[in-house]
Amino acid sequence: QSPIFGPQDVSSIEGNSVSITCYYPDTSVNRHTRKYWCRQGANGYCATLISSNGYLSKEYSGRASLINFPENSTFVINIAHLTQEDTGSYKCGLGTTNRGLFFDVSLEVSQVPEFPNDTHVYTKDIGRTVTIECRFKEGNAHSKKSLCKKRGEACEVVIDSTEYVDPSYKDRAILFMKGTSRDIFYVNISHLIPSDAGLYVCQAGEGPSADKNNADLQVLEPEPELLYKDLRSSVTFECDLGREVANDAKYLCRKNKETCDVIINTLGKRDPAFEGRILLTPRDDNGRFSVLITGLRKEDAGHYQCGAHSSGLPQEGWPVQAWQLFVNEESTIPNSRSVVKGVTGGSVAIVCPYNPKESSSLKYWCHWEADENGRCPVLVGTQALVQEGYEGRLALFDQPGSGAYTVILNQLTTQDSGFYWCLTDGDSRWRTTIELQVAEATKKPDLEVTPQNATAVIGETFTISCHYPCKFYSQEKYWCKWSNDGCHILPSHDEGARQSSVSCDQSSQIVSMTLNPVKKEDEGWYWCGVKEGQVYGETTAIYVAVEERTRGSPHINPTDANARAKDAPEEEAMESSVREDENKANLDPRLFADEREIQNAGDQAQENRASGNAGSAGGQSGSSK
């Protein structure tokens, strides 16, 4: 008695696919050991055709796969494009050899059935239209024409030329002649349903001189396409239902017992379980559309169907396409926070994982909008300008080699609440969904900038301070200048870091930045933030306005400014005296380079290492893109 279980007999027809599930006992060893599918030879030897170690035999090349589902203790063998040569005895099993634990499976592949010579076979999918062609001799040109369906010995009339239509074919069947043709009539049956399948007889005339034709109608249920996706990845259902339903509402539904529950349709219906992680996109004017679901969960596995009907709901006799989605829990996509919470006026740092093998891919962040089909306009990207309304408060920090990038959004308002997607132009499976929840702030923000009314005067020295609480004592503090392509880290000086680590005076933890001398191009948004290595934390933003010195205003020289800064105990401002260098050398030239060259993992890793020192106790500073 084998502990492995599966289907003992599998039967299909040529050209079809089979999906064979083998069940194994739920043990750690079984979950991780080799899985195989082999063909039993007459000599007792079982020749491996495919295994979970990556082996694929020549005869299965391009048409078979083996997928392990450890969380279900199953593995699935898919074989497509079956031929009669595939008929035989097989084993599905576990172990390093093909003699371990196994289960015997018999596969029988038959020819597509043939019919008598005078029978025309029509094969159509559910919901489609069939046109049955009926030939007759000239002698029956003016005789009654009819189509009937065989039920046992009887043949029940479906439609005839006297305008009779069987009630079950009402509004679906029409009998017509084309042009001047005197020897053929046609019967169209639309919105085909499974019970329409069977043998039909068309007839012109009565009695022994009647002309008869046999037609065998096969109505095919949609063969589900098998989709295997990792937990937390995304899936796209590509739906092509044909021109005849191009103008009807489209839907995607999930089969549940005898119903199919609509997940999304083009009339604005959407299942709350997919809120924030689904998009329906029309592909062309011929009725093609796709549905993308991100952040796949275990419970998303199941049978899906797309279709079209004016109601936006599944309707018998309308075309459908089917899929079976499997969700593999052994995912390469890391588990990241699905909900991020922030407060008004505060900030959030969202970590977006991406395929580490694609560090040069372009990264994006978009805001999912719940219009009728769902859409996700890009707010920021490695080569996309920050969207209007997000200037000065949104930036994307790439961290090449780490398999993640960070998006920071500050000056939060409750309108920022909603769903956001992390995506790249590379591996589409790595789309992740984050729900941002912004609540009203109940206390002062952790980071505060002084002066809050920041106006700098050209040619003078301008110092801006960022006060941080003791809880950020051990973290790196930085200042950066926001621009449309990121927030570039500036030299700054952290006062709190110079204190003894034994005590922490809540009132005197300051990181300051000095512009000396102020230039017109210094105008803009500046961020004060904290981070630990490549993990970004809280930020706050301030807009620094720059104005010409008005006549009569006192000129404060840099030393006075420094002296004034020194009046505040524990605070020692560090000026940007190497202003020319900073503006020229430290701005990343690749920001203006060709699109293909914009990402260079090596360089950027260097850059991030440099910025890691900004504001450290030794007074070192660095700048980064």
Epitope: F5, Q8, D9, S12, I20, E221, K255, T259
Partner: nanobody, 126 residues
Framework: QVQLVESGGGLVQAGDSLRLSCAAS????????MGWFRQAPGKEREFVTT??????????YYADSVKGRFTISRDNAKNTVYLQMNSLKPDDTAVYYC?????????????????WGQGTQVTVSS
């Protein structure tokens, strides 16, 4: 809803054959698999055999205890599943239930089936 009606049970001698039928009506289009379970007095309901399908492909599953003796088949046009039982043994005595499922993860698990018939008694005397 799907309604299932079993027939063909009865009293037979050990070694004899019997053919059970299960006719499905209602929304049968949504079914994905149909099978047979049995329950002997004082015992748990036990998996016997199941047939699942996808288009023109059929998958037949059997319990070890009936392999080689029982055969499941279906007539698509009649929405009927048959269980041909050969070489019957006294151990096969039980009430045989027909079950249907819309989505099946493991055909051996009774809770995976959405619809059940009333059952038909099979008694095998020695």
């Amino acid at each position: 809803q799907v309604q299932l009606v079993e027939s063909g049970g009865g009293l037979v001698q050990a070694g004899d054959s019997l053919r059970l039928s299960c006719a499905a009506s209602g929304r049968t289009r949504t079914t994905y698999g149909m099978g047979w379970f049995r329950q002997a007095p004082g015992k748990e309901r036990e998996f016997v055999t199941t047939i699942t399908w996808s288009g023109s492909t059929n998958y037949k599953y059997y319990a070890d205890s009936v392999k080689g003796r029982f055969t499941i088949s279906r007539d698509n046009a009649k929405n009927t599943v048959y269980l041909q039982m050969n070489s019957l043994k006294p151990d096969d005595t039980a009430v045989y239930y027909c079950a249907a499922s819309t989505v099946l993860t493991d055909p051996r698990v009774p809770t995976e089936y959405d619809y059940w018939g009333q059952g038909t008694q099979v008694t095998v005397s020695s």
